[in-house]
């Protein structure tokens, strides 16, 4: 069971300091941006991280949403990353959810975060380079210290 607590506005970056944003086709990607670029591209660069109380504490349970024309929430249903047109619900009556991720700091690196799927244990949000693009994917952790599954989260409130 997950019960919604507070939400915060955040900028999410990969370890190359590229900013996560949602393009016009609702596609998540990471791009080099100055702070000015980041502000100019808001709200597509600003993510609503909603925290949830977890009946089985396993890390900080969160949803990740973005509000452009409508609110879309990140899902990893079927191990496929997509943004679904929905508000983060107040309550989720299950121990797993396709929209709940466990946000945890990387051991020894308090400022680096990982997001593990609550539906698929051992699967993490990751940044993958494909052609000249840096995409958001879901990835099974294969090796310790995999930098592709580490992010920084900067609160904008």
């Amino acid at each position: 069971y997950f019960g919604k607590l507070e939400s915060k506005l955040s900028v999410i970056r990969n370890l190359n300091d590229q900013v996560l944003f949602i393009d016009q086709g609702n596609r998540p990607l990471f791009e080099d941006m100055t702070d000015s670029d980041c502000r100019d591209n808001a709200p597509r660069t600003i993510f609503i991280i909603s925290m949830y109380k977890d009946s089985q504490p396993r890390g900080m349970a969160v949803t990740i949403s973005v509000k452009c024309e409508k609110i879309s929430t990140l899902s990893c249903e079927n191990k496929i990353i997509s943004f679904k047109e929905m508000n983060p619900p107040d309550n989720i009556k299950d121990t797993k959810s396709d929209i709940i991720f466990f946000q945890r700091s990387v051991p020894g690196h308090d400022n680096k975060m990982q997001f593990e799927s609550s539906s698929y244990e051992g699967y993490f949000l990751a940044c993958e380079k494909e052609r000249d693009l840096f995409k958001l994917i879901l990835k099974k952790e294969d090796e310790l210290g995999d930098r592709s599954i580490m992010f920084t989260v900067q609160n904008e409130d």
Epitope: N26, P28, L29, K79, I80, K140
Partner: antibody
Framework: EVQLVQSGTEVKKPGESLKISCKGS????????IGWVRQMPGKGLEWMGF????????RYSPTFQGQVTISADKSFNTAFLQWSSLKASDTAMYYC??????????????WGQGTLVTVSS | EIVMTQSPATLSVSPGERATLSCRAS??????LAWYQQKPGQAPRLFIY???TRATDIPARFSGSGSGTEFTLTISSLQSEDFAVYYC??????????FGQGTRLEIK
Amino acid sequence: EVQLVQSGTEVKKPGESLKISCKGSGYTVTSYWIGWVRQMPGKGLEWMGFIYPGDSETRYSPTFQGQVTISADKSFNTAFLQWSSLKASDTAMYYCARVGSGWYPYTFDIWGQGTLVTVSS
Amino acid sequence: EIVMTQSPATLSVSPGERATLSCRASESASSNLAWYQQKPGQAPRLFIYTASTRATDIPARFSGSGSGTEFTLTISSLQSEDFAVYYCQQYNNWPSITFGQGTRLEIK
């Protein structure tokens, strides 16, 4: 380059077995579903099944369940489609295609070039 | 399963003219619909997803519309390279995806 490369044309007799392959490169193959699609001569596209190479989870179309086997070898970034006993009606072009994630979710965003299978006595 | 029906089966249009291809779902597919183009001897190529969003490098003359059970692919001014077979595909209840039977767009 992001691509799926399929094995070559096959000519087989009815009753024979066959395994065709689809090798992904240029992306994290273990993080995307691969689908198999049949196209019989002069006909449309039919979804056969999916495999997630990261853990070999499979989903089959009811039409093809029990008729074919889909597998993967993640160490070689390769998915396979196999038949234990071919029929003349299996003659078709078979495509593998990647299922989009993040970008183009749930659609087939990258396609292999196709493997033509001909079954004839 | 959701059955997808495309019409017409064949559409004859002159270059420079507008082409409108239709796709109907037997039950709601929401906006979870894609369009693919296939040329002879080639694999299909993704053109439109979520009913109306063009994939990368797809020209602006292609536009998709619709939701629920009725969908349309429109090509505003046909170029010679646009003559091909177009398939719609629903993915609303993935993994149970289904394709339409295709519309052949030919030169008039």
